[in-house]
Interface confidence: low
């Protein structure tokens, strides 16, 4: 495993007596059952601690909640529970933070038994707050526009759609019956609505609808529709096709006026499509396999969201609305990490640097042995436990973590073998962006990454003991420190650190409880004077990312173009700071095969880099729709990937030529594209975006 | 439509052997875990063991390794449940399901066969 | 092995009354857990897997919540035709286990 506490470690001086300086205790009196912890704005210091107690007595539930407020990074926290009246506030969806650092906090009030709900709202970082009543009884939390944090989105629990022009002090009602609602871009709102009344049953006939003035006019931008999401610039729906129970994948890129069938297999009833990620170049999708199977394909877009190659087989997702592992690795450009289910009924994890373009194993660690698993001791692979193993009740405290201003690091659960173990895992790190990893830490830990990577903590889960030590290391996982930061161990429920990973605080959060007693308890550990000095130009060193053949003049080049970076030396013991910017150095590369991705009517025999013609449409005229236009295509098949920068070697030309003819899709379109004043619809019915949590972009 | 049709009741004497079969229909029987789950009279579910018949790979409880085992035969789609020697307290219903998930033992037992009762008496 | 226990053993229940049964497993299973119901001389049928996913053409009175260690099972308004035994079942690890089960007459 790697270097403890011993000679190849630089231990940090006098560490104890500095942290336990910076060491802050808050004792919450009070019993509640669950704590939730909200960040307000960046770089404020100002946390919002919510804790609630529910009971249920006979057919209703009894609750009470305390509002804590810190305004150091957690180091003190003051009961604000007054300034909202002593008020029950929802823990589900009850606090709602405004985006960038507008200082906008709503609270949803739990107003049993009544019609309306009620709302507490502050516009300077939870200081002061104004009730204010609702018209209705939200189902989820209140909705921000990205673009204007004065307007709010609700949906009821009639299915009712609500919005607010003045941060929830007036509500109007825009719609009935609708299932699903979303902000897209420039305070734009996208609905589907059904009036038959039901969300549930009837999903393939529901109508998507827009509004680009809050309401006051709609128009109808689909029908026959069973689900719809945003990703990246683009806009999805999932529709009946006429034929049977098969629906498909429409997209749109200007926000619905026009759209185009993505060139994705339909899928039945038993089966869905889910938006793994998405930016504004190319979106990655799944689709699940016909049957039961809890795997399907992955395929990436192309800058259109129309062409699709497949990326990943037997990609595994389990039941609908169940689990991937799919992750997104920010902290280096093009990584992904992902399972497939093997063709023994084994989990694999699998890798890819180049934005799904080739998929490989994840290189063993050198300094683990392959697991009794392994059929060939000496070959055998790492394997990442995520949202997969979490849901299938392993230890795994933790999902994968990785920050874009801490380039390159990458810290995760996993096992060494021939594909994922059952035994408890161990920490592992990376600190190429998943190129190479090292056993970091054993046993499952909580952990998170300090001042944009400058510092790692970690606390080992413990579930039948208390905990009373904290881990750091300065070197990105190579060494650890020990401390102590209680005497008497607390039982351990997680750590809270500002999100962006620029801070140098972290919370210990946990209970403490007796016989007659139970109360939380928060250690806000500052790591201020173990970084002592801000860091220098000497501190840092240039590292080439994605580099794997230092011989090669194309060594480093992903998607047309490489990026040296300026990084810290593990050595360096110093403060990158809160305004720490990433410096990089992005150079050109030349075009190859590899930087274009087949276009329509064209694939790519394994192991080959070569586009050729799906026999079946050799020699026929391309013809397809897009945008509502049919276009006649003239390709040797190749178009460019998305986001690559290549210039020079290789470029075979493409051509469009438009037949501007109209060909729009009758199962999205209306008989007549329809457009109305404010109006609305009885029934009742719901329907709830299930991903958004797990960063899916978009599920069915 | 996914069928599983069990064979029929059984009456033994203690010592006796016993193999009860489960057919399955409508669906790709290889991709499929078959479990076996017994019910003593008047009590509840017990899960005994499954196995994956594309490749036989078989998990037990604890509580009926080496008591049963599980088998299956994927040439005419059917998994069997066998005892070497009874004992009365093998006196039982014994049901066949399958698995909601194809290809891997998470999940729930989605089609039940009609059970096929087990009477073991001197 | 995960061990699961139900509560209640029995009740006797009045139609349209609301019945919550629960299942507490012994460590963490996610939401690998599911329910079934079975009738007098019947095989058990699924009626919610993964805690909260209703099985296709289970009336819509039965949804099923939790997560983690506590999981329960919500018979909206009871119709006479629910009279039955209820059990749940984890598949988080094996063995699987089912708890005991929950025993729901019409009084």
């Known amino acids: 495993s790697a270097p403890g506490e011993d000679e190849e470690c630089g231990r940090v001086r006098d560490f104890v007596a500095k942290l336990a300086n910076n060491t802050h205790q808050h004792i919450f009196n009070d019993l509640s059952g669950s704590v939730s912890l909200s960040w307000v704005g960046d770089s404020t210091g100002v946390i919002l601690v919510l804790t609630t107690f529910q009971v249920p007595i006979f057919m209703i539930t009894i609750g009470q909640s305390k509002l804590y407020r810190s305004e150091d990074y957690g180091k003190n926290f003051k009961d604000i529970t007054d300034l909202i009246n002593n008020t029950f506030i929802r823990s589900d969806f009850g606090i709602a933070i405004g985006p960038e650092n507008s200082g906008k906090v709503v609270l949803t009030a739990d107003v049993s038994g009544s019609h309306g709900s009620r709302i507490f709202r502050s516009s300077d970082f939870a200081k002061n707050f104004v009730q204010q009543e609702l018209p209705f009884v939200p189902l989820m939390q209140i909705m921000y526009s990205p673009q204007n944090s004065d307007y709010l989105l609700a949906l009821s629990n009639k299915n009712e759609l609500w919005v607010s022009k003045n941060f929830g002090g007036k509500w109007e009602k825009l719609y009935d019956t609708v299932c699903l609602a979303k902000w897209g871009s420039d305070n734009t709102i996208f609905f589907t609505a059904n009036h038959n009344g039901s969300c549930s049953n009837d999903r393939g006939m529901l109508e998507l609808w827009r509004t680009s003035d809050l309401g006051k006019s709609f128009k109808t931008i689909g029908s026959k529709i069973y689900s719809f999401g945003l990703g990246g610039r683009f806009l999805f729906a999932s529709v009946m096709t006429g034929k049977g129970t098969l629906r498909a994948i429409h997209v749109s890129t200007d926000q619905g006026d026009t759209w185009s069938m993505a060139q994705l297999p339909p899928v039945g009833h038993e089966q869905f499509y889910s938006i793994l990620a998405a930016n504004d170049d190319m979106v990655f999708m799944h689709v699940d396999e016909p049957g039961d199977s809890g795997f399907g394909t992955i395929f990436t877009s192309d800058d259109r969201g129309i062409v699709y190659s497949k990326s990943l087989e037997r990609h595994l997702y389990t039941t609908t609305g169940g689990e991937t592992d799919f992750t997104n690795v920010t902290s280096l450009r093009g990584v992904y990490i992902t399972s497939i289910l093997a063709e023994d009924k084994s989990v694999q994890s699998m890798i890819t640097f180049d934005q799904g373009g080739r998929w490989t194993h994840l290189r063993k660690p050198e300094n683990s042995k392959c697991d009794a698993t392994a059929r060939d001791p000496e070959k055998c692979s790492l394997h990442i436990h995520a949202a997969y193993s979490i849901a299938t009740g392993l230890n795994v405290p933790m999902l994968p973590l990785s920050e874009p201003n801490a380039v390159g690091i990458v810290i995760a659960h996993g096992s060494v073998g021939d594909a994922i173990s059952v035994m408890r895992p161990d920490v592992y790190i990376s600190d190429d962006g998943g190129y190479s990893w090292t056993k970091a830490l054993e046993g499952p830990h909580h952990y998170t990454i300090l001042d944009s990577g400058g510092i790692i903590v970690a606390v080992e889960q413990n579930a039948h003991q208390g905990v009373n030590q904290i881990k750091f290391s300065t070197d990105e996982g190579q060494c650890w420190q020990t401390y102590n930061f209680t005497k008497d161990p607390i039982f351990f429920t997680g750590l809270a650190s500002e999100p962006g990973a620029r801070s140098m605080n972290i919370s210990i959060w946990g209970y403490r409880s007796s016989l007659f007693h139970q109360y939380w308890i928060s250690y806000t550990i500052d790591f201020k004077d173990i970084l002592e000095r801000n860091c220098e130009e000497k501190d840092y060193t240039i590292w080439l990312a994605h580099s794997t053949d230092p011989e090669d003049y194309e060594d480093g080049c992903i998607l047309g173009y490489k990026e040296q970076f300026l990084r810290l030396r593990k050595s360096s013991v110093c403060q990158n700071g809160r305004d720490y910017v990433v410096t990089k150095q992005p150079s050109i590369c030349l075009c190859s095969l590899e930087d274009f991705l087949c276009d329509f009517g064209y694939y790519r025999p394994e192991n080959d880099s070569k586009c050729v013609e799906q026999p079946e449409l050799k020699g026929h005229d391309l013809e397809f729709c897009l945008y509502g236009r049919e276009e006649h295509l003239t390709t040797n098949g190749y178009r460019k990937i998305p986001g690559d920068k290549c210039q020079g070697g290789v470029n075979p030309v493409r051509e469009v030529k438009d037949l501007k003819k109209k060909c729009t899709s009758n199962f999205l379109s209306p008989e007549k594209q329809n457009s109305k004043s404010n109006g609305s619809a009885g029934g009742s019915g719901g329907l709830n975006d299930i991903f958004e949590a797990q960063k899916i972009e978009w599920h069915e | 439509e996914v069928q599983l049709v069990q064979s029929g009741a059984e009456v033994k004497k203690p010592g006796e052997s016993l193999k009860i079969s489960c057919k399955g229909s409508?669906?790709?029987?290889?991709?499929?875990?078959i479990g076996w789950v017994r019910q003593m009279p008047g009590k509840g579910l017990e899960w005994m063991g499954i196995?994956?018949?594309?490749?036989?790979?078989?998990r037990y409880s604890p509580s009926f390794q080496g008591q049963v085992t599980i088998s299956a035969d994927k040439s005419i789609s059917t998994a069997y449940l066998q005892w070497s020697s009874l004992k009365a307290s093998d006196t039982a219903m014994y049901y066949c399901a399958r698995h909601s998930r194809g290809s891997f033992w998470y999940g729930a037992f989605q089609h039940w066969g009609q059970g096929t009762l087990v009477t073991v008496s001197s | 092995e995960i061990v699961l226990t139900q509560s209640p053993d029995f009740q006797s229940v009045t139609p349209k009354e609301k019945v919550t049964i629960t299942c507490r497993a012994s460590q963490s299973i996610g939401s690998s857990l599911h329910w079934y119901q079975q009738k007098p001389d019947q095989s058990p049928k699924l009626l919610i897997k993964y805690a909260s996913q209703s099985f296709s053409g289970v009336p819509s009175r039965f949804s099923g919540s939790g997560s983690g260690t506590d999981f329960t099972l919500t018979i909206n308004s009871l119709e006479a035709e629910d009279a039955a035994a209820y059990y749940c079942?984890?598949?988080?690890?094996?063995?699987?286990?089912f708890g005991p089960g929950t025993k729901v007459d019409i009084k």
């Open positions: 196995i994956y018949p594309g490749d036989s790979d078989t």
């Open positions: 079942h984890q598949s988080s690890s094996l063995p699987h286990t």
């Open positions: 409508g669906y790709i029987f290889t991709s499929f875990w």
